[in-house]
Structures are given as C-alpha cells and as structure tokens.
Interface confidence: low
C-alpha cells in the first residue's frame, strides 16, 4: 500500500499528544503508518 506523504499524514493525525518523532521510532514502514492510523481511528 502507500501513496501520498506519510509525514503529512502523521502530522495531520496526531492523537494523545504523541509526537512525530516517537511514532516514527516505533513504526518501520509506510504500510505501518497506514495501519497504525487506520486502526487507531477505526477503533474509536
């Protein structure tokens, strides 16, 4: 998957006071970013 800028996606989607740096340190790929935010928002 993928497409677009994952950095832009992260900056527009930050929740729970997490920082861009901390998220990038725990997610290894663009696909991880996609799934992380999908599940985060989907389980609200």
């Amino acid at each position: 998957g993928g497409g677009g800028s994952k950095h832009k996606c992260v900056q527009n989607s930050l929740v729970n006071n997490e920082t861009l740096e901390s998220i990038m340190n725990t997610l290894e790929s663009e696909e991880d970013f996609r799934k992380y935010f999908y599940y985060l928002e989907g389980s609200k």
Epitope: G2, G3, G4, N12, D32, K35, Y38, Y39, E41, G42
Partner: antibody, heavy 122, light 113 residues
C-alpha cells in the same frame, strides 16, 4: 437515508473516455475513505481505486493506473472515477463503496452503490 | 499482491445444515502490532451489490444474523453459516485489506441441496 447513488455508465468505444459519479447522502461524506470496485459480467469482484476522506491520498490497481483517476468533491458529496483509454477488459459493473470508519485510509466496505454498467465495445 | 483463494467454488447444503467456506491468503494478513486480521467477508445476491457480513475476520456487521460467523488467523480463514436458510443462497467473497491492492477471493456460490 444513508445511500450512494451512481450515474455515468454506458457504452463507449475502445480508447474512449467516461466519467462515473457517485452521490452520497445520509452521512458526513468528507469523513470517509471511498473506493471503486468493479465486477466483469459473471465474474468476481476487483478493487479498482480508493481515495482518502480529504482526497489527499489515492490508490490504484495496476490494471488501471495511469488510465483512471479517482477524485472527490466534498462540497458536493460526490465521488468520481474518470476513465480514459478504455479497453474491452474494462467492461464491468462499477460499484462505489464506503469505508465504515472515520479514517483517512480505505479498507473494507459497509455501504455500496447499486452499480453502473460500463461496456467497452466497438 | 496478496492472492486470495476460496474453496470450494460452489457448495450445495440442505436447509438447516451447516455451510463452511474457506479462504486462504498468499501471505499473512495478521498485523502483529494490533493483533488484527485484515480480512472481511461479503455476501452478494444476483443483481445486487455485495453486502458486508464480517470484518476483522470475526466481527459481525450490525444487523447480520448470528448464524454467520468468521474465524481464522494469519493466512487461513473460514466463514460458517450455522443453519442455512433459503435467503442465504448467494455468492460469498473474502477480501483482504492488509495492503493495497485490496484483493478478493474468486467467490463461493452457496446453493440449496
């Protein structure tokens, strides 16, 4: 009423163009990722393209990349699929489909349009 | 791309009996970070669009009868109709949404024996 109303199908010659529309109602359209899924006559389902709620992110199947363009107008609650350089193998019923979560990323589909038939033939 | 393979292609079951459809993915659709399987099941009746039955491999969509259940993890999944009803005659599809391009199984046609 929560629904997706499709329009824009029809008969087109190979190499031609067509634009499909999908008008959404009953939910906050801009909150949801949307996809197009097609089904050739008598065949199974094939995901074609997807777009995030904001329209910032788009995704395509290899079979249509470079020929089809997905877009949305959130002010009109409408999803589009611009189809260029059409081929006989693009003949199918095209469905628009909504993702069930308020997410920027598409995944699975809880609301479907009724479908519109696109026939590519000379 | 992740290939999805369903078995059998068609299935004839007596009313009130159990129907079991299998779906196998060419690679795991289990995402370890959240322990979720990115797999959905749909029902499609003739002349109608598909209808979502199951997502996250085992979560039943609202309004779907409880005779429909999903199970499995990783690469092997099952849709079970515990007691087949006449209105369940349809084609059933699995779909992975682990990664784009999202892919569907070829479909399993369920009929009454």
């Amino acid at each position: 009423q929560v629904q997706l109303v499709q329009s824009g199908g029809g008969l087109v010659q190979p190499g031609g163009s067509l634009r499909l529309s999908c008008a959404a109602s009953g939910f906050t359209f801009s909150n949801y990722a949307m996809s197009w899924v097609r089904q050739a006559p008598g065949k199974g389902l094939e995901w074609v393209s997807a777009i995030s709620g904001s329209g910032d992110n788009t995704y395509y199947a290899d079979s249509v990349r470079g020929r089809f363009t997905i877009s949305r107008d959130n002010s009109k609650n409408t999803l589009y699929l611009q189809m260029n350089s059409l081929r006989a193998e693009d003949t199918a019923i095209y469905y628009c489909a909504k993702d069930p979560h308020s997410s920027r990323w598409p995944g699975f589909f809880d609301l479907w349009g009724r479908g519109t038939l696109v026939t590519v033939s000379s | 791309d992740i290939q999805m393979t369903q078995s059998p292609d068609s299935l004839a079951v007596s009313l009130g009996e159990r129907a079991t459809i299998n779906c196998k993915s060419s690679q795991s659709v289990l995402y370890s970070s959240n322990n979720q399987n990115y797999l959905a099941w749909y029902q499609q009746k003739p002349g109608q669009p598909p209808k979502l039955l199951i997502y996250w491999a085992s979560t039943r969509e609202s309004g779907v009868p409880d005779r429909f259940s999903g199970s499995g993890s990783g690469t092997d999944f099952t849709l079970t109709i515990s007691s087949l009803q006449a209105e369940d005659v349809a084609v059933y599809y699995c779909q992975q949404y682990y990664s784009t391009p999202y892919t569907f199984g070829q479909g399993t046609k369920v009929e009454i024996k």
